[in-house]
């Protein structure tokens, strides 16, 4: 038995931030689980981890330097990534492992989400031209 995961095919991070929602064919209520987001076709980089446990607060962390937060729904985990760089444009995959109560369950590999990071406009806006020279 495998959990199915649905993700948006593509998201654009205009302000270097994005919300990526991972929707699961499984209710995470009262389960102990580890949801993670992985970068690259080979899922080589673990971007963010959300660890859920019946007795503790949700733990969210990145061991790879990403600025991330996570939010839990009954059948979803939403990853909020901030301070993304243009060169972090890539495909991102949701992964889920449910450990307790048994049996252990993980997911079929999803199709992934292409996150396209658009660079911030660094030019001054015409409405706010910046300080004028004396």
């Amino acid at each position: 038995n495998k959990i199915l995961v649905k993700q948006s095919p593509m998201l654009v991070a205009y302000d270097n931030a994005v919300n990526l929602s991972c929707k699961y064919s499984y209710n995470l209520f009262s389960r102990e689980f580890r949801a993670s987001l992985h970068k690259g076709l080979d899922s080589a980089v673990e971007v963010c981890v959300v660890y859920g446990n019946y007795s503790q607060q949700l733990q969210v962390y990145s061991k790879t330097g990403f600025n991330c937060d996570g939010k839990l729904g009954n059948e979803s985990v939403t990853f909020y990534l901030q301070n993304l760089y243009v060169n972090q444009t890539d495909i991102y995959f949701c992964k889920i492992e449910v450990m307790y109560p048994p049996p252990y369950l993980d997911n079929e590999k999803s199709n992934g989400t292409i996150i396209h990071v658009k660079g911030k406009h660094l030019c001054p806006s015409p409405l706010f031209p910046g300080p004028s020279k004396p």
Epitope: Y54, E97, Y100, P101, Y104
Partner: antibody, heavy 118, light 111 residues
Framework: EVQLVESGGGLVQPGGSLRLSCAAS?????????WSWIRQAPGKGLEWIGD???????YYNPSLKSRVTISRDNSKNTLYLQLNSLRAEDTAVYYC???????????WGQGTLVTVSS | DIQLTQSPSSLSASVGDRVTITCRAP??????????LHWYQQKPGKAPKLLIY???NRATGIPSRFSGSGSGTDFTLTISSLQPEDFATYYC?????????FGQGTKVEIK
């Protein structure tokens, strides 16, 4: 028939580290079960140390999490336990075991004794 | 952690006796109709051996004199007619929640 054979036990100095091996035969460690390390202090009960899942994910007892690493070498069909900053109370027989789908331990190795003493 | 309490801690019995060991959890270890409670036998100098899994299922090769029962918080291991090879220590284990925990053991000795 699944067989598990632990090795690497012996006398270790306090503050030192241990690295134990568990060679599995009769079953591939990547074939869908989970593999655990459990220990038993002399004359005491059983304590679960942690697991490595068939996916490669690891999972540890919070009481030992900061000092323990479980890994595997798929090509050798072998599991490993690394335990750091050893103290006298880590003296125990260390077992590796296979977990079934509902996390009962259905196969065990013979155990290897680790003694932490100066 | 779920701390399992076994009783008695030790008992003396004779060959042919009916022996009952109990294991109590502070909260239910059931989920969706299944009990995540298992029983092991350990002889001196040997690894534990799985006897009963999921509260009442005998593991492969375990004689029918061993049986398990119970649900929720209270579980029982019964040896219907004690044999000489049954003198050992018995442990219960829960796998409902992490960390996995074991009872403190019940030593069955010869009277």
């Amino acid at each position: 028939e699944v067989q598990l054979v632990e090795s690497g036990g012996g006398l270790v100095q306090p503050g030192g580290s241990l690295r134990l091996s568990c060679a599995a035969s009769g079953y591939s460690i990547t074939s869908g079960h989970h593999w655990s390390w459990i220990r038993q202090a002399p004359g005491k009960g059983l304590e679960w140390i942690g697991d490595i899942y068939h996916s490669g994910s690891t999972y540890y007892n919070p009481s030992l999490k900061s000092r323990v690493t479980i890994s595997r070498d798929n090509s050798k069909n072998t599991l490993y336990l690394q335990l750091n900053s050893l103290r006298a109370e880590d003296t125990a027989v260390y077992y590796c075991a296979r977990k079934d789908d509902y996390y009962a331990f259905d196969y065990w190795g013979q155990g290897t004794l680790v003694t932490v003493s100066s | 952690d779920i701390q399992l309490t076994q009783s008695p801690s030790s008992l003396s019995a004779s060959v042919g006796d009916r022996v009952t060991i109990t294991c109590r959890a502070p909260q239910s270890v059931d989920f969706h109709g299944k009990s995540f409670l298992h029983w092991y036998q350990q002889k001196p100098g040997k690894a534990p051996k799985l006897l009963i899994y999921d509260a009442s299922n005998r593991a492969t090769g375990i004689p029918s004199r061993f049986s398990g029962s119970g649900s929720g918080t209270d579980f029982t291991l019964t040896i219907s007619s004690l044999q000489p090879e049954d003198f050992a220590t018995y442990y219960c284990q829960q796998s409902y929640r992490s960390p996995i925990t074991f009872g403190q053991g019940t030593k069955v000795e010869i009277k």
